[in-house]
Interface confidence: low
């Protein structure tokens, strides 16, 4: 058992039939010693009287809010919250796997530049009784830190007969050095309580693994006299890491039309401008990717062929 | 060619043959994303390689100010990987295939590390970790840890170089 | 300066009670997880009890529970051991140790600071 | 209950030469969040316990650096580089990983 916050625990469970549990001890947080009663929840049940009350906790009815009393008054409470371990494997029933980029990945995160600032999302199917809290550090045995601000609902989606709840988070190193080279993963730490259950889920990342430019900007086609060839032109997204001399980007440059099943032109390039051959309702796009490391691209940004 | 003394670095050089080795170094292990080396207990093997770290004056303000701090630096990374990729993790068995990646960027890590070295001037290197896995297994393992950070390594001293080369070079 | 100060040992007949204060200074008591660790002469550490910043959970080692109640004061910055039914083998020196986040998962605490012990010797 | 099992439970060292003390615990000390829940306390004769590494391998503040600790799982190891004659005492290992919290039987380290 452990302290979640004041007056909130997490009572660690091995989840199987006719597991003991864990015995607890409450304490009354009071200088009195006479007349104390407890209640757990909404119920005015007396589950005991006197400054402690030991309990067994086996299962979710036996979590929840206890709360002792003296004549009539509230004293204190204690929130007992359940985090399940079946076959030695703690529970991940809140979150929704999202698979990519392998199994088991609940946390998903992304940065636009080196500026140790960063965004990390997560789904879930349940739509309250729902809290998160993150905390993030670069390092775990000496953390050097990072600053989270709060899980927000970002966005819903219908899958199915499913509702889907994407819930995203900004963090933001304290004393970030975008020029440096990584040595120490930074850690994501996401406390998931759902009614009166706890979960935790971890990601752990460099920001070069994480990087992922917004989409070049400005992109515009300029049509070269007397041929069927145009010079696209683009600019570095406003977000990323500047001065461009050192953070430099790389440029994949399509042209594609109507059909999907049409043959694909690609160039790649160094520069912010190409030439290429304009056929008719195709469209061109350009994304971007660090130069020098292969992290992700960038979304496409486009523009049409007429 | 050199250094001499504190003197500049053929910048446009360095860019070109540090830009190579990142290609290189992508191409010798290409599905970093498709292996979390970090689960697979990191203690003794790439621990002990050097940094480029904030102190180091590889940003772009440090460069302005005395790029020899950093060229020091990355001349002490690229002797240390090279010898790293020159050792028996990367010559014994599971032999690399004849095509492999591994040789050239070898070769264009001692290339670039000469670039740097000034003239009848040694900078102090890094000592390397003894390092000698038993099992091929953990040889293998060994190599996608060492490229990877490698990955990392030459990302950076590719970013001095081109900045040097767009506004350091006389 | 951080300290840890254990009172209220002595001597005590089987079956007696005593009651052992520890007063902390020099960091904010009421952030830490206290513990107290006796040892037996000549022998190891053990491990007797255990509470929570704020005090709304404590734990118990097998030996002692139902007999001892630990509980705090974090108004008065004092840390508190009740012994009931005292047993020749509950003779022992008692340290209280205080207890540190380690900068990993949130329940992880380890004993930095401890006091310089008070002796319970339980005798007829 | 979790044991802790320490060795040697006597270590006789010359001054200047590095020691060795292993724990072992009946079930593992690791978490799944990736932290050993194991520290090392050293207990200098007439003195109370003070602990020198926390989490299997950090120092402890004010710790000299020829204390270091390694291991994972249920085999732990406490190494000093050089031993200097103020070392002495008794070791002892002890699991957080689930109460009762336990120590191991403490290994006596003195000066030949």
């Known amino acids: 058992i452990w302290e979640l916050k004041k007056d909130v625990y997490v009572v660690e469970l091995d989840w199987y039939p006719d597991a003991p549990g864990e015995m607890v001890v409450l304490t009354c947080d009071t200088p009195e010693e006479d007349g104390i009663t407890w209640t757990l929840d909404q119920s005015s049940e007396v589950l005991g009287s006197g400054k402690t009350l030991t309990i067994q906790v086996k299962e979710f009815g036996d979590a929840g809010q206890y709360t002792c009393h003296k004549g009539g008054e509230v004293l204190s409470h204690s929130l007992l919250l359940l985090h399940k371990k079946e076959d030695g494997i703690w529970s991940t029933d809140i979150l929704k796997d999202q698979k990519e980029p392998k199994n088991k990945t609940f946390l998903r995160c992304e940065a636009k530049n080196y500026s140790g600032r960063f965004t990390c999302w997560w789904l879930t199917t349940i739509s309250t009784d729902l809290t998160f809290s993150v905390k993030s550090s670069r390092g775990s045995s000496d953390p050097q830190g990072v600053t989270c601000g709060a899980a927000t609902l970002s966005a819903e989606r219908v899958r199915g007969d499913n509702k889907e709840y994407e819930y995203s988070v900004e963090c933001q190193e304290d004393s970030a050095c975008p020029a440096a080279e990584e040595s120490l993963p930074i850690e994501v730490m996401v406390d998931a309580v759902h009614k009166l259950k706890y979960e935790n889920y971890t990601s752990s990342f460099f920001i070069r693994d994480i990087i992922k430019p917004d989409p070049p900007k400005n992109l515009q086609l300029k049509p070269l006299k007397n041929s069927r060839q145009v010079e696209v032109s683009w600019e570095y997204p406003d977000t990323w890491s500047t001065p461009h001399s050192y953070f430099s980007l790389t440029f994949c440059v399509q042209v594609q039309g109507k059909s999907k099943r049409e043959k694909k032109d690609r160039v790649f390039t160094d520069k912010t401008s190409a030439t290429v051959i304009c056929r008719k309702n195709a469209s061109i796009s350009v994304r971007a990717q660090d130069r020098y490391y292969s992290s992700s691209w960038s979304e496409w940004a486009s523009v049409p062929c007429s | 060619r050199a250094v001499p003394g504190g003197s500049s670095p053929a910048w446009t050089q360095c860019q070109q043959l540090s830009q190579k080795l990142c290609t290189l170094a992508w191409s010798a292990h290409p599905l970093v994303g498709h292996m979390d080396l970090r689960e697979e207990g990191d203690e003794e093997t790439t621990n002990d390689v050097p940094h480029i770290q904030c102190g180091d004056g590889c940003d772009p303000q440090g460069l302005r100010d005395n790029s020899q701090f950093c060229l020091q630096r990355i001349h002490q990374g690229l002797i240390f990987y090279e010898k790293l990729l020159g050792s028996d993790i990367f010559t014994g068995e599971p032999s690399l295939l004849p095509d492999s990646p591994v040789g050239q960027l070898h070769a264009s890590l001692l290339g670039l590390s000469q670039l740097l070295q000034p003239e009848g001037h040694h900078w102090e290197t890094q000592q390397i970790p003894s390092l000698s896995p038993s099992q091929p297994w953990q040889r293998l393992l060994l190599r996608f840890k060492i490229l990877r950070s490698l990955q990392a390594f030459v990302a950076v001293a590719a970013r001095v170089f081109a900045h040097g080369a767009a506004t350091l070079s006389p | 300066e951080v300290q840890l100060l254990e009172s209220g040992g002595g001597l005590v007949q089987p079956g007696g009670s005593l009651r052992l204060s520890c007063a902390a200074s020099?960091?904010?008591?009421?952030?830490?997880?206290m513990q107290w660790v006796r040892q037996a002469p000549g022998k190891g550490l053990e491990w007797v009890s255990s509470i929570w910043s704020s005090g709304g959970i404590t734990l118990y080692a097998d030996s002692v529970k139902g007999r001892f109640t630990i509980s705090r004061d974090n108004s008065k910055n004092t840390l508190y051991l009740q012994m009931n039914s005292l047993r020749a083998e509950d003779t022992a020196v008692y340290y209280c140790?205080?207890?540190?986040?380690?900068?990993?998962?949130?329940?992880?605490?380890?004993?930095?600071?401890w006091g310089k012990g008070t002796t319970v010797t339980v005798s007829s | 209950d979790i044991q802790m099992t320490q060795s040697p439970l006597s270590l006789p060292v010359t001054p200047g030469e590095p020691a060795s003390i292993s724990c072992r615990s009946s079930?593992?000390?690791?978490?799944?969040?990736?932290?050993?829940?194991l520290d090392w306390f050293l207990q200098k004769p007439g003195q109370s316990p003070q602990l020198l590494i926390y989490?299997?391998?950090n120092r402890a503040s004010g710790v000299p650096d020829r204390f270091s600790g390694s291991g994972s799982g249920t085999d732990f190891t406490l190494k000093i580089s050089r031993v200097e004659a103020e070392d002495v005492g008794v070791y002892y290992c002890m699991q957080a990983r689930q109460t009762p919290y336990t120590f191991g039987q403490g290994t006596k380290l003195e000066i030949k």
């Open positions: 020099g960091f904010t008591f009421s952030d830490y997880p």
């Open positions: 140790a205080r207890g540190t986040h380690g900068g990993g998962p949130p329940w992880y605490y380890y004993m930095d600071v």
């Open positions: 079930q593992s000390l690791l978490h799944t969040h990736g932290y050993n829940y």
């Open positions: 989490m299997g391998s």
